[in-house]
């Protein structure tokens, strides 16, 4: 145990007085308990406005989370309530009290208020490993673009302090098993692999153990490779629109492209009563294209002001790069001012046929 750290086990609805500033109090509650933390003003003087923070994020009061200036109550505690709690002065963000809270699976036994006689039964002084931040171990799949870095973390505790080892696809994993090696931080319960490549794909398991038990967590790593492709246009954009005569309309087109894309907005027109030429290519007029001072962001929006009936029709966002072209189209329906608006998606089903 480090100096200034006290380990206690607390029963249901036990109020815990705050430690001296600078100390971190470690507290264990049972599932279903009411976590109650108390932070009296230092020296008994006025405290000023305070804020309660969990894992760096301000706590929002709710039916289950009761926040007061000197006291915090979390009712019906569960695993997700484990974490680092602090009471801070709102203006200066100075930490007045700091608590490390762990909520165990089993409800704490007995109804005594101070909980002091429970320490022998809970296995905190000597006990099997447990995850200290289970709520931050939910991301089981990491999909990482090649050449970036991956960090697996399995923050744990136990007494005696457990050891951590790593497996890849169920087998012992060591630095010599990969080009570029690995970096281990036992104090941070972490494994780092720099500049990942496709051969790094697989299941990575941390095994945390001491003489009282063993726990493990498996993460899956997928390494993504980029193959050159024509621009990708976001699905559903541009969207069909219905507008009243004289109103303003915006069409949006979101373009993803490795190579620098060239974006154009086109309006489909008729020539001699025909929408397509002899070769089947549609007749279009270019409404917007890249200019000297036009940014990609500006090109992703087509604005039509004070629309007329002539503006009704089909509009296309066309994006091209060195590999090829992609396009999405949408329809504009213009209604007389007195008619009620028709839902845009209904209009789409009528006109986009």
């Amino acid at each position: 145990e480090s100096l200034g750290t006290e380990q206690r086990v607390v029963g249901r609805a036990a109020e815990v007085p705050g430690p001296e500033p600078g100390q971190q109090e470690q507290l264990v509650f049972g599932s279903g308990d009411a976590v109650e933390l108390s932070c009296p003003p230092p020296g008994g003087g006025p405290m000023g406005p305070t804020v309660w923070v969990k894992d760096g994020t301000g706590l929002v009061p709710s039916e289950r989370v009761l926040v007061g200036p000197q006291r915090l109550q979390v009712l019906n505690a569960s695993h997700e309530d484990s974490g680092a709690y602090s009471c801070r002065q709102r203006l200066t963000q100075r930490v007045l009290c700091h608590f490390s809270v762990r909520v165990t699976d089993a409800p704490s036994s007995g109804d005594d208020e101070d909980g002091e006689d429970e320490a022998e039964d809970t296995g905190v002084d000597t006990g099997a490993p447990y995850w200290t931040r289970p709520e931050r171990m939910d991301k089981k799949l990491l999909a990482v673009p090649a050449a970036n870095t991956v960090r697996f973390r399995c923050p744990a505790a136990g007494n005696p302090t457990p050891s951590i080892s790593w497996l890849k696809n169920g087998r012992e994993f060591r630095g010599e098993h990969r080009i570029g090696g690995i970096k281990l931080r036992h104090q941070q319960w972490s494994l780092v692999m720099e500049s990942v490549v496709p051969s790094d794909r697989g299941n990575y398991t941390c095994v945390v153990e001491n003489k009282f038990g063993s726990i493990r967590q498996t993460y899956t790593l997928d390494v993504l490779e980029r193959s050159p492709h024509r621009p990708i246009l976001q699905a559903g954009l541009p969207a069909n629109q219905t507008a009243v005569l004289g109103s303003d309309v915006e069409f949006h087109c979101k373009v993803y492209s490795d190579a620098q894309p060239h974006i154009q907005w086109l309006k489909h027109v008729e020539v001699n009563g025909s929408k397509v030429g002899p070769d089947g290519t549609p007749y279009v007029t270019v409404l917007k294209t890249a200019g000297a001072n036009t940014t990609d962001k500006e090109l992703e929006v087509l604005s039509l002001h004070n629309v007329t009936f002539e503006d009704a029709g089909e509009y296309t966002c066309l994006a091209g790069n060195s590999i090829g072209f992609s396009h999405h189209s949408a329809w504009l329906v213009v209604l007389p001012a007195e008619e009620e608006l028709v839902e845009a998606d209904e209009a789409g089903s009528v006109y986009a046929g």
């Epitope: 931050r136 171990m137 990482v144 050449a147 970036n148 960090r151 973390r153 500049s195």
Partner: antibody, heavy 127, light 107 residues
């Protein structure tokens, strides 16, 4: 060998525009990113923005948002910083830096690390 | 924005000295902290990432520690090439922000 070479700096009048280029070589441009960082004469470092090649996303510092645009042509392995409506306070050496992500099981965010830097190009905004 | 405050702003030391620079974040940044070294007229160089991981090719006399809001860069035995300005930088919050720098000068 990883290399980044900036170009396009120079003297420009307030309100003017300038486009900086960052030619990169020696790493897979499409999987990582390019950040721009500037340093005013005698001052510290200020992050300007980042282009993330994997999804084409960009992020900017508030001080340049709406005026500066980062783009890239991955077929040329080159990133660009388009600077419009320039002000005297934009005077600085501009660096581009290869940027990779640290993807962590622990966090929803990605930590971005700038590991290779160009030599810098000086932009002076003055009338 | 997350403010990064380095201390001291400057220090004088001799070759062989152990030097410690601290960096404090205005809010929790977990371990998303990097340290850079910059010589006059040159581009910065990455030393440490994720608070404590030594970047490849960086001498082992450099080490980093800390998490949350308080971080430390230590140079165990100062060498002539280590006289420079050192910056910390967080990247957990948007925008990424740098400390104001610590200049390490020859005593």
């Amino acid at each position: 060998e990883v290399q980044l070479v900036e170009s396009g700096g120079g003297l420009v009048q307030p309100g003017g525009s300038l486009r900086l280029s960052c030619a990169a070589s020696g790493f897979p441009f499409t999987s990582t990113g390019i950040s721009w960082v500037r340093q005013a004469p005698g001052k510290g470092l200020e992050w300007v923005g980042r282009y993330w090649a994997w999804d084409g996303s960009t992020n900017y510092a508030d001080s340049v948002k709406g005026r500066f645009t980062i783009s890239a042509d991955t077929s040329k392995n080159t990133a660009y910083l388009q600077m419009n409506s320039l002000r005297a306070e934009d005077t600085a050496v501009y660096y581009c830096a290869r940027t990779y992500g640290i993807y962590d099981t622990y966090d929803m965010y990605t930590e971005y690390v700038m590991d290779y830097w160009g030599q810098g190009t000086l932009v002076t905004v003055s009338s | 924005d997350i403010q990064m405050t380095q201390s001291p702003s400057s220090l004088s030391a001799s070759v062989g000295d152990r030097v410690t620079i601290t960096c404090r974040a205005s809010q929790d940044v977990d371990t998303s902290l990097a340290w850079y070294k910059q010589k006059p007229g040159k581009a910065p160089k990455l030393l440490i990432y994720s608070a404590s991981f030594l970047y490849s090719g960086v001498p082992s006399r450099f080490s980093g520690s800390g998490s949350g809001t308080d971080f430390t860069l230590t140079i165990s035995s100062l060498q002539p090439e280590d006289f420079a300005t050192y910056y910390c930088q967080q990247s957990t919050g948007h925008p990424q922000t740098f400390g104001q720098g610590t200049k390490v000068e020859i005593k």
